[in-house]
Amino acid sequence: TQNKALPENIKYGIVLDAGSSHTSLYIYKWPAEKENDTGVVHQVEECRVKGPGISKYVQKVNEIGIYLTDCMERAREVIPRSQHQETPVYLGATAGMRLLRMESEELADRVLDVVERSLSNYPFDFQGARIITGQEEGAYGWITINYLLGKFSQKTRWFSIVPYETNNQETFGALDLGGASTQITFVPQNQTTESPDNALQFRLYGKDYNVYTHSFLCYGKDQALWQKLAKDIQVASNEILRDPCFHPGYKKVVNVSDLYKTPCTKRFEMTLPFQQFEIQGIGNYQQCHQSVLELFNTSYCPYSQCAFNGIFLPPLQGDFGAFSAFYFVMNFLNLTSEKVSQEKVTEMMKKFCSQPWEEIKTSYAGVKEKYLSEYCFSGTYILSLLLQGYHFTADSWEHIHFIGKIQGSDAGWTLGYMLNLTNMIPAEQPLSTPLSHSTYV
């Protein structure tokens, strides 16, 4: 029995990402005796909750518990029963709930209250449900990707354990795109910041990081589209909107009440002489791009440099991981390869958007039409946001890495959130022990 390995003491954690369009549950695991090491936590499961995001359950708030049942039961199956009581569960809600809170704090509180009551009924160690700030969302996304890329590890290696790792300790910036907001987070070259609101200081594994972050509410891909439509319908001469961001031959009737129900379109709201209008796609990338640019106010900047809408943005520095909808959209369009230049991406988008709707439906027969119809706009929006919004150039484009997963774990804010709340990222570098005492007897 001298060399017989003892069963490893494994710990688990659960984070629910309550996004604007849907909720996902992530299960993480790690060896208990290594929980202060970098890179040991990994995702074992993602469960996508069927149905829309929790902010849409306002009229059916008591059913939120039922909505979460399948994924919570899945967690019960995946995590060994003996571990249930010590497994923390966190729910973080993002921009969909931030928008609901802007409309009605009472309704947002009611939704969260029902979520908390529902999640408390499971045998796990429920730690609470809250709306995280945009700054947290950006910061935790940055922590996640750098943790998974091994950037916090002080051990130098002659080999690369993960893609994109250039064996240096320079952190990656994080670009996150959701349905209702988008975040940019990175370590700028200049340590001093002109805008304290956008500055974060971390001490992780014995090293100080001065991080820039900003979350643009209403600039997620879904809310950006609603903004664009609200802007464009202002100048429409009748109830037909010829839209370059949709394929030629595509038609969709939109209710004006749906258009104006989000706080994101308030600035464009006006009394229209019709209750509905019809979008008719004309599929022109260049015109779509121009229309999207009108959402970014670049005429005012009280700092040395801005992104848009008067928000400070320091000069871009280093490599960036672009994840969530940045990845999902670009992956669908087959544009995630490191070898594809920005010029080539633009060219491909022009070609894609100009394809007739009937042709697109035939080519992607397995994809739901509601999603299929969005890719021309979403792809164009991503290019506009990165190039004109964040000032990436044709040259710096090659520093953007579209990332879905790193080492089997999804890129996103949830892992960083859990690492922080479980105190698994120490401020100081842990003393390395040659051999874990619990491994052999």
């Epitope: 369009s21 849907h22 069927k50 149905g51 039922i66 399948d70 209702a180 609603w226």
Partner: nanobody, 124 residues
Framework: QVQLVESGGGLVQPGGSLRLSCAAS????????MGWYRQAPGKERELVAA???????NLADSTKGRFTISRDNTKNTVYLQMNSLKPEDTAVYYC??????????????????WGQGTQVTVSS
């Protein structure tokens, strides 16, 4: 759109049983859960039982041990088996389905479909 058709209601004596059926048709792939609600005269509509697309069930406290909800995926039908019925179970029973609205666009909305309702009367 999803259409829901209920059947199986009627008059039954206290202690008796009934089985309600709800047949769904249309774009049911987007349905996250189906359930039965009831509304007694002068009272608010209340959830009786629900079953998720994953087959997990939820029952109201007042019906636990007496009612069961099940489904037959091949027939797209959900059943509510009601045993040991009491006079206070008298109500109009409605079938409900909800989930992701396939007609919504750029940010998913909730779809919420209801049947016409079937009367259940428990009386001697």
């Amino acid at each position: 759109q999803v259409q829901l058709v209920e059947s199986g209601g009627g008059l039954v004596q206290p202690g008796g049983s009934l089985r309600l059926s709800c047949a769904a048709s249309g774009s049911i792939s987007s349905i996250a859960a189906m359930g039965w609600y009831r509304q007694a005269p002068g009272k608010e509509r209340e959830l009786v039982a629900a079953i998720t697309s994953g087959g997990n069930t939820n029952l109201a406290d007042s019906t636990k041990g007496r009612f069961t909800i099940s489904r037959d995926n091949t027939k797209n039908t959900v059943y509510l088996q009601m045993n040991s019925l009491k006079p206070e179970d008298t109500a109009v029973y409605y079938c409900n389905a909800w989930g992701e609205d396939d007609s919504s666009w750029f940010g998913t909305d909730l779809c919420d479909y209801w049947g016409q309702g079937t009367q259940v009367t428990v009386s001697s």
